[in-house]
Interface confidence: medium
């Protein structure tokens, strides 16, 4: 179960939102906060460990999901094209 | 799954190359692709990689601030660009697909057949 | 850098180990790479530590323990005779994640 702790948005660059969320999350053993379907989820600590955040399903149904290259996040494509970038800190 | 490389050829100090992998057998826009390169009677070495939209790309430190890599998901074409060319970056280039989506020297799964580069005056 | 012997050798039947150590990324494994003339392309014979290609014969197998990394070939056989490099990712701050093999392994099949 997660619950999320804070939610700053901040919108004021054209075209571009920065969201920055924090989630607890009460995890089984061999498991620790992550991101699922875009929602805070229990996931397999091995995944954080080897920073393949994709095997998360991160992205919402129907988008891509894409580990960037420096493995510090993800992106989601939208069927249309659109991306969304999310960076792991 | 079949990878095809072009390109190559006898290339001048200094100048430019563009090779192009052309993929097919998969479903091209959802694997990360990269180039590795191999010298006359040397081993592997990495050249770079790029995600599967194209939105990012990393470098071997060699080719760092001269190669390019990009894509073009509608023609399942990858395509590295190397300027000012050096006698060094004469060898034998391959193009590799990633498995499972990400692609790492560990998780390469198919090779093209490569495309030989010879820098020389 | 991977370290990899420069060479090991066989005769055919026999069990073959060829050991990888080194490298920056452990979680993302280690893969191998059969390369049989310096003209031709490597084939993939192990990716992600043990996840065998399903055109590679089951005889070909990845193990790890600790940093070291393992390429067993189980009942080796003529057409085996190759050069085999290992892969992993190493770690810079300057580049980032980049791939880096060994130097290569011969295998000789007596």
């Known amino acids: 179960t997660c619950e999320i702790v804070t939610l700053d948005r901040d919108s004021s660059q054209p075209r571009r939102t920065i969201a920055r969320q924090t989630a607890r999350c009460a995890c089984r053993k061999g498991q620790i906060a992550g991101t699922t379907r875009a929602r805070p989820a229990c996931v397999d600590a091995r995944i954080i460990k080897t920073k393949q955040w994709c095997d998360m399903l991160p992205c919402l149904e129907g988008e891509g999901c894409d580990l960037l290259i420096n493995r510090s996040g993800w992106t989601c494509t939208q069927p249309g094209g659109r991306i969304k970038t999310t960076t792991v800190s | 799954v079949t990878l095809d490389e072009s390109g190559g050829g006898l290339q001048t100090p200094g100048g430019a190359l563009s090779l192009v992998c052309k993929a097919s057998?998969?479903?091209?826009?959802?694997?990360?692709m990269g180039w590795v390169r191999q010298a006359p009677g040397k081993g592997l070495e990495w050249v770079g990689v790029?995600?599967?939209?194209?939105?990012?790309?990393s470098y071997g430190s060699a080719v760092k601030g001269r190669a390019t890599i990009s894509r073009d998901n509608g023609q399942s074409t990858v395509r590295l660009q190397l300027n000012n060319l050096r006698a060094e970056d004469t060898g034998t280039y391959f193009c590799?697909?990633?498995?499972?989506?990400?692609?790492?020297?560990?998780?390469?799964?198919?090779w093209g057949h490569g495309t030989e580069v010879i820098v020389s005056s | 850098a991977l370290t990899q012997p420069s060479s090991v050798s066989a005769n055919p039947g026999e069990t073959v180990k060829i050991t990888c150590s080194g490298g920056g990324s452990s979680g993302y494994g280690y893969g191998w790479y059969q390369q049989k003339s310096p003209s031709s392309a490597p084939l993939t014979v192990i990716y992600w530590n043990d996840k065998r290609p399903s055109d590679i014969p089951s005889r070909f197998s990845g193990s790890k323990s600790g940093s070291t990394h393992t390429l067993t070939i189980t009942g080796v056989q003529a057409e085996d005779e190759a050069v085999y490099f290992c892969?992993?990712?190493?770690?810079?701050?300057?580049?980032?994640?980049?791939?880096?093999f060994g130097a290569g392994t011969t295998l000789t099949v007596l």
């Open positions: 590799a697909k990633g498995s499972a989506s990400y692609i790492t020297a560990a998780t390469i799964d198919a």
């Open positions: 892969g992993n990712d190493d770690y810079s701050s300057d580049s980032g994640y980049v791939g880096v």
């Open positions: 790029i995600n599967k939209s194209g939105s990012d790309t």
């Open positions: 057998g998969f479903t091209f826009s959802s694997y990360q």
